[in-house]
């Protein structure tokens, strides 16, 4: 998977008046990394692992960047003409990626009241707008404003892209991100399904990086894809990930099944507990 940095900023308006604050979150490699603390007006690391990325360096640069981005987005919201009464939001999501072959990608997306209305591929300078008339109107509105604003030239977008990549590379220089390996905790549980059947679930949690293989085997051989149900690989809030795989088996057949896990070159297999024993937990 590519390394990525994702900025998510939101500004709000009430009865046509743009509010002073903004919400901001930054994700590094899909993990919550930074957020903007509105009380302290500072960028704050999300959790210990994020603090470890920069060690004892300050977060001044991140604070300055987020504050500037928030200000820009507030100005953009002020120029949206069709603001009706009540609460409205403008959200900007910016993503830059560095792939294994060192190629880079960068994109920017705008949402109004949670609805996507404008996207840009920064490398190709292509803008795309969804079909709906509301999206078309909003996109025209915003693009006109961005064109008027001398700052928002092609060079500006490329500079923004370059800044994002520079920050991403700076974070990646930290061995915490590049060499971080947290092995999963794997546990197998069983639950009654229907008469004579049970559902066995294999859960992997607290692992990093995100890539993992988790599959059920019967008599040592992997079950076909369509007999297993997989959960998404999701952040668990601690800078690590979690996922699961489940399958339905006949009661009494537990001894024929194992959950196979492979992560960062390590592997383990986990049997199904029989009978009354409900959970078998292991950490390799």
């Amino acid at each position: 998977e590519p390394h990525s940095l994702r900025y998510n900023l939101t500004v709000l308006s009430w009865d046509g008046s743009v509010q002073s604050g903004f919400l901001a979150e930054v994700h590094l490699d899909g993990q919550p990394f930074l957020r903007y603390d509105r009380q302290k007006c500072r960028a704050k690391p999300q959790g210990q692992w994020a603090e470890d990325v920069l060690g004892n360096k300050t977060w001044d640069r991140e604070t300055r960047d987020l504050t500037g981005n928030g200000k820009d987005l507030r100005m953009t919201l002020a120029h949206i003409k069709d603001q009706k009464e009540g609460l409205h939001s403008l959200q900007e999501i910016r993503v830059c990626e560095i792939h294994e072959d060192n190629s880079t990608r960068s994109s920017q997306h705008f949402y109004y009241d949670g609805e996507l209305f404008l996207s840009q591929n920064v490398e190709t300078e292509e803008w795309t707008v969804p079909q709906s008339s509301r999206a078309q109107t909003l996109a025209m509105n915003v693009r006109n404003f961005l064109k008027e604003d001398a700052m928002k030239t092609k060079t500006h977008y490329h500079a923004m892209h370059a800044d994002c990549l520079q920050e991403l590379r700076r974070y990646l220089e930290s061995s915490v991100v590049l060499r971080r390996r947290v092995p999963p905790m794997v546990n197998v549980t069983r639950s009654e399904a229907s008469e004579g059947n049970i559902t066995v679930t294999c859960r992997a949690s607290s692992f990093y990086p995100r890539n993992i293989t988790l599959t059920w085997r019967q008599d040592g051989v992997s079950l076909s894809h369509d007999t297993q149900q997989w959960g998404d690989v999701l952040p668990d809030g601690n800078g690590t990930y979690q996922t699961w795989v489940a399958t339905r088996i006949c009661q009494g057949e537990e001894q024929r099944f194992t959950c196979y896990m492979e992560h960062s070159g390590n592997h383990s297999t986990h049997p199904v507990p029989s009978g009354k024993v409900l959970v078998l937990q292991s950490h390799w």
Epitope: G220, G252, E254, F257, T258, T269, S274, V277
Partner: antibody
Framework: QIQLVQSGPELKKSGETVKISCKAF????????MNWVKQAPGKGLKWMGW????????TYADDFKGRFAFSLETSASTAYLQINHLKNEDTATYFC???????????WGQGTTLTVSS | DIQMTQTTSSLSASLGDRVTISCSAS??????LNWYQQKPDGTLKLLIQ???LLHSGVPSRFSGSGSGTEYSLTISNLEPEDIATYFC?????????FGGGTKLEIK
């Protein structure tokens, strides 16, 4: 730690019956099946089959159907191999081995030597 | 039944040598292969499962590889305690079948 301890050597005559035991230590007996494996003198290993220690259901390889019987005493965490109507060709060392996921023999007993004389 | 063949029934090597033991299956077994070690006193131990995955506690000088019908076990730096007979076993199909074994001796 995990251990499988088998009963001692047996000297039998043709036509007799033998019952070999395999006692498990260090794990939940009913979570793993038990395999039985035969090794004739100077020969390789031959899988005889396995018994599901949770349901008690045995599975026999084709060459071991008929005179061979797997059984359990779950309360004592013990599996048994019984061979009826013994023949000279039953002379061998018999191993029990824990059945992990029904594909792996991850822990083995020390083996029980059976000698059948005519 | 799937026949497992270990063509070399005995092998002589010196301490410190790199030794490779081979095993071939009568049909493709999709890497569903395990390796076991039997010491001269008869004690049997699992070494490798699924062609190349080392069982816990097995020294890293042991490694496994192969695909299709051809598989091998390599000991990178032969030590005195490696003197034993080595068996491969397939679990692609029932019945489970073992190779005839390769006896490793010191020169």
């Amino acid at each position: 730690q995990i251990q499988l301890v088998q009963s001692g050597p047996e000297l039998k005559k043709s036509g007799e019956t033998v019952k070999i035991s395999c006692k498990a230590f260090g794990y939940t007996f009913t979570n793993y099946g038990m395999n039985w494996v035969k090794q004739a003198p100077g020969k390789g290993l031959k899988w005889m089959g396995w018994i599901n220690t949770y349901t008690g259901e045995p599975t026999y390889a084709d060459d071991f159907k008929g005179r061979f019987a797997f059984s359990l005493e779950t309360s004592a965490s013990t599996a048994y191999l019984q061979i009826n109507h013994l023949k000279n060709e039953d002379t061998a060392t018999y191993f029990c081995a824990r059945n992990y996921g029904n594909y792996l023999f991850d822990y083995w007993g020390q083996g029980t030597t059976l000698t059948v004389s005519s | 039944d799937i026949q497992m063949t270990q063509t070399t029934s005995s092998l002589s090597a010196s301490l410190g040598d790199r030794v490779t033991i081979s095993c071939s299956a009568s049909q493709g077994i999709s890497n569903y292969l395990n390796w076991y070690q039997q010491k001269p006193d008869g004690t049997l131990k699992l070494l490798i499962q699924y062609t190349s995955l080392l069982h816990s506690g097995v020294p890293s000088r042991f490694s496994g590889s192969g695909s299709g019908t051809e598989y091998s076990l390599t000991i990178s730096n032969l030590e005195p305690e490696d003197i034993a007979t080595y068996f491969c076993q397939q679990y692609s199909k029932f019945p489970r079948t073992f190779g005839g074994g390769t006896k490793l001796e010191i020169k």
